[in-house]
């Protein structure tokens, strides 16, 4: 997208109820105008669960989302809900680009491989577009887990990416289960990792102007018999209205006696993670599996402060397992929406 262009979704007609999620890359400084529903009965716009005011630099007004000049902090998930109902009219993520090509880890490949982009700007050597997604360098992953390494990059011409393992070209042909190379997502995915997957994984990003590289160090930890198993999908993402009661459920299976904790993720000094790489958490509930209803976390009379990420952590003599869910708390008068499920993560 050229910096002078305006990002628009037109016309302003009520879309189908089967609204697909969209991702749009927006150049810094670019104006944005997105429409949702008919002007007279336009929907309400929300950013990350908070309703946008009708005035200000970023505003939701008569069914329109308007951003005068796109800034990095404007990136994120935007939702438009029909007035007086829970119908999702628009569900999209705005991604920060720049005056050159840009890419997001999971964006539509067309958005940064458009040939019309290729000659619009001077040539540029590859550069990392999302270095914050590459901060975790030393990975220690239990055997059987899935590992995803990402090296989102851009440049002109659009660079290519290839992967090395311990300095050698890596295509996964000798790996049971193979690998998934998603070049348009700049990612390498390995499922059910085993000790032979240990090593240094290098992403090499190149174009005619130059090249950059980044190393991920992977260790695979063997654990037998097994740590607790948590039922998939639990706890579930939940949306509640202020003042209501919420129950989060966690189903734990374990041979060895498990110990269960409910945690709420918190922010300290503006950071969600401590120096050790683990998230800051507050312990809400702790007990053994035999305790009554330890697998349920009750939140009474929820307020906006209760919104956030909750984790069920189960441990036994072998190790730890955990799964997380998001609680979204909306004002009483506003319709509800359910946040996207967080990425599955492994314990470092």
């Amino acid at each position: 997208l050229e910096a002078s262009e305006e990002v628009e979704l037109e016309p302003c007609l009520a879309p189908s109820l089967e609204q697909q999620e969209q991702e749009l890359t927006v150049a810094l400084g670019q104006p944005v105008r997105l429409c949702c529903g008919r002007a007279e009965r336009g929907g309400h716009w929300y950013k990350e669960g908070s309703r946008l005011a009708p005035a200000g630099r970023v505003r939701g007004w008569r069914g329109r989302l308007e951003i005068a000049s796109f800034l990095p902090e404007d990136a994120g998930r935007y939702l438009c809900l029909a007035r007086g109902s829970m119908i999702v009219l628009q569900n999209l993520t705005l991604i920060t680009g720049d005056s050159l090509t840009s890419s997001n880890d999971d964006e539509d490949p067309k958005s940064h491989r458009d040939p019309s982009n290729r000659h619009s700007y001077p040539q540029q050597a590859p550069y990392w577009t999302h270095p914050q997604r590459m901060e975790k360098k030393l990975h220690a992953v239990p055997a059987g887990n899935t590992v995803k390494f990402r090296c989102p990059a851009a440049g002109n011409p659009t660079p290519t990416i290839r992967w090395l393992k311990d300095g050698q070209a890596f295509h996964g042909e000798n790996r049971i289960g193979g690998i998934r190379l998603r070049h348009q997502h700049w990612s390498l995915v390995m499922e059910s990792v085993v000790p032979s997957d240990r090593g240094t994984y290098t992403c090499l990003v190149e174009n005619a102007v130059g090249s950059i590289r980044y190393n991920y160090l992977l260790d695979v930890l063997e654990r037998s018999p097994h740590r607790p198993i948590l039922q998939a999908g639990l706890p579930a993402n939940t949306t509640a209205v202020v003042g209501s009661d919420v129950e989060l459920l966690c189903k734990v299976y374990s041979d060895a006696q498990p110990h269960i904790q409910w945690l709420k993720h918190i922010v300290i000094n503006g950071s969600s993670f401590g120096a050790d790489g683990f998230p800051y958490v507050q312990v809400l509930k702790t007990a053994d599996i035999n305790s009554s209803e330890v697998e349920v976390l009750y939140l009474r009379n929820v307020s906006a402060e209760d919104a956030g990420e909750y984790t069920c952590l189960a441990g036994n003599s072998i190790g730890l397992s955990y799964q997380s869910a998001w609680l979204t708390v909306l004002p009483e008068e506003d319709p509800t929406w359910t946040a996207a499920a967080p990425e599955a993560r492994y314990t470092d």
Epitope: K137, L138, R198, Y214, N215, L217, E222
Partner: antibody
């Protein structure tokens, strides 16, 4: 208490060998990458070697490659550095350090002095 | 010769703000996060800043870090006499034969 305690330093002649140990306590040793860092008298910090939690992967500075070997015994919560063919320039205080997923050393031992001299 | 370049010394008076720079290349600071360590005389190093600008718990907010391109800096505001120490920047280096963990040569901070 979370701590690292080095031992094994001392005086050794050029060409000789020495084995350093680092006893860890208070954290899950087996899932942490560990490193050795040294500091020559009056000089700055220099990375020597790192090892993955399982011990399956090791990494070395060019200055010690082929002479030093890093290893660990997770059942004893102990990190080792076997130093062979020692040179005068290997004289330093050797620290062991616990690494985080972000590649930073959050925990350091108090250090052990290795002197290589004839 | 250290891979990362720091000024050998810096100084300031109590209450002042002091900045220490750290210069590297695309293979280290340009691609990896920067950490800062404080080493008080006769003691082991201590982590001061990680992930470019994050402080571990217990580190006063007088210490702050930043990174831009292939350079990083550590700022100390409201300088105190107990801040007199050696300060080291560090980052992983992903050059051809890497990975390596590299340090700056250290900056000796004197509180006048």
């Amino acid at each position: 208490e979370v701590q690292l305690l080095e031992s094994g330093g001392g005086l050794v002649q050029p060409g000789g060998s020495l084995r350093l140990s680092c006893a860890a306590s208070g954290f899950t040793f087996s899932s942490n990458y560990m490193s050795w860092v040294r500091q020559a008298p009056g000089k700055g910090l220099e990375w020597v070697s790192s090892i993955s939690g399982s011990g399956g992967r090791t990494y070395y500075a060019d200055s010690v490659k082929g002479r030093f070997t890093i290893s660990r015994d997770n059942s004893k919560n102990t990190l080792y550095l076997q130093m062979n063919s020692l040179r005068a320039e290997d004289t330093a205080v050797y620290y062991c350090a616990r690494m985080t997923v972000f590649g930073a050393a959050t925990l350091w031992g108090q250090g052990t002095l290795v002197t290589v001299s004839s | 010769q250290s891979v990362l370049t720091q000024p050998p010394s810096a100084s300031g008076t109590p209450g002042q703000r002091v900045t220490i720079s750290c210069s590297g290349s695309s293979s280290n600071i340009g691609s990896n996060t920067v950490n800062w360590y404080q080493q008080l005389p006769g003691t082991a190093p201590k982590l001061l800043i990680y992930r470019n600008n994050q402080r571990p718990s217990g580190v006063p907010d007088r210490f702050s870090g930043s990174k831009s391109g292939t350079s990083a800096s550590l700022a100390i505001s409201g300088l105190r006499s107990e801040d007199e120490a050696d300060y080291y920047c560090a980052a992983w280096d992903d050059s051809l034969n890497g990975p390596y963990w590299v340090f700056g040569g250290g900056t000796k901070l004197t509180v006048l």
